[in-house]
Interface confidence: low
């Protein structure tokens, strides 16, 4: 049974040219986090943090994405095109997959960095839970579906 919840930074805004930290936190579960995937609004992967293997930043983002803090991600040199949804996907064992959503609005430098309507939603429960059935074929450490497709 999936008892955990994902907390995210919710709706955030940042200045064009600046940087922002995308952060999710999994609570209320003892499940082991085997991997965290960070995806952009079009489902492109920005980065993966695997418990055993460390970080893999996808080359399309390597100039502008820094791993951390923790399991979070720092997005730098923001452009207006970075506005949109970001998803953290926590692959856990034995629970399955938890998913959180963050909406980032990149503002022109002339606009105040944090508008009130974004500020009020900081740290909402990011609410999308997905459960995948896993095939544990490598020593029972759990984690990802046995598939060649998207995760």
């Amino acid at each position: 049974m999936m008892t955990g919840t994902i907390e995210t930074t919710g709706n955030i805004s940042a200045k064009k040219g600046g940087s922002v930290i995308l952060q999710c936190h999994l609570s209320s579960t003892m499940a082991q986090v085997t991997q965290v995937n960070w995806e952009q609004h079009d489902h492109s992967l920005l980065a993966i943090r695997n418990a055993e293997l460390g970080w893999h930043i996808y080359p399309a983002f390597k100039d502008r994405v820094a791993p951390g803090p923790g399991l979070g991600l720092t997005l730098q040199s923001l452009t207006m095109n970075d506005t949109g949804e970001y998803f953290c996907t926590y692959h856990t064992y034995p629970d399955g997959t938890y998913r959180g959503r963050i909406f980032l609005e990149v503002l022109e430098s002339s606009v105040a960095e944090h508008s009130a309507r974004f500020q009020e939603n900081l740290y909402f429960q990011g609410l999308e839970h997905h459960h995948h059935h896993h095939h544990h074929h490598h020593g029972g450490s759990g984690g990802l579906p046995e598939t060649g497709g998207d995760r």
């Epitope: 995806e39 492109s44 992967l45 055993e52 293997l53 970080w55 893999h56 930043i57 399309a60």
Partner: antibody, heavy 122, light 111 residues
């Protein structure tokens, strides 16, 4: 069916250029990175570079920078590699390969073209 | 000289298990690099067998398994069959860096 269909074999003179194409079908072309990997006769695999069509982001291995141009035409779901200043050691089979995951280029390749033999000979 | 070192050849009899190693020899492809394994039959394109060290794409036999300890990743093929005879390549994709292939290992199925 997801597949990558490559252009036919080429014979080129040293110093010239060659352009190989790779037409994708069966999936959303723009979303997946396409890499180019070559294999000289009797030798191993060598990653040359790749492109993520959605971002038009190109990554080229250091060894090939300045000699390789990788492009993609989203309207025809086709990726291209052009190699200039050809020399005899560029004789190889050139493969295009699709990234396992959307958004990446150069991680793990789940779909491969059949390869294009490029022979460089005077 | 590849930054990934593989044995040139390994062999085994049908039904046996064989293991092919792949050791990262540079900091870039050290312990925090993702590894994949490819099978290539003569005259054919490579086929992805294992990715991210130990995950199998759909359609790949569960006789193929991957593991990693420190800088060395391993591909184990159990219940060896004649059709497993091929070249096997490991590859690494380190954080924010280029894909690297090992020089390849020729697997011979005896008898």
């Amino acid at each position: 069916e997801v597949q990558l269909v490559q252009s036919g074999a080429e014979v080129k003179k040293p110093g010239s250029s060659v352009k190989v194409s790779c037409k994708a079908s069966g999936y959303t072309f723009a979303s997946y990175g396409i890499s180019w990997v070559r294999q000289a006769p009797g030798q191993g695999l060598e990653w040359m570079g790749g492109i993520t069509p959605f971002f038009n982001r190109v990554d080229v291995a250091e060894k090939f920078q300045g000699r390789v141009t990788i492009t993609a035409d989203k309207s025809t779901s086709t990726a291209y590699i052009e190699l200039s200043s050809l020399r005899s050691e560029d004789t190889a089979v050139y493969y295009c390969a699709r990234d396992l995951r959307r958004g990446g280029v150069g991680d793990a390749f789940d779909i491969w073209g059949r390869g294009t033999l490029v022979t460089v000979s005077s | 000289q590849s930054a990934l070192t593989q044995p040139r050849s390994v062999s085994g009899s049908p039904g046996q298990s064989v293991t092919i190693s792949c050791t990262g020899t540079s900091p870039d492809v050290g312990s925090h690099a993702y590894r994949s394994w490819y099978q290539q039959h003569p005259g054919k394109a490579p086929k992805l067998m294992i990715y991210e060290v130990s995950y199998r794409p759909s359609g790949v036999s569960n006789r193929f398994s991957g593991s990693k300890s420190g800088n060395t990743a391993s591909l184990t093929i159990s219940g060896l069959q004649a059709e497993d005879e091929a070249d096997y390549y490991c590859s690494s994709y380190p954080p924010s860096s280029a894909t690297v292939f090992g020089a390849g290992t020729k697997l011979t199925v005896l008898g």
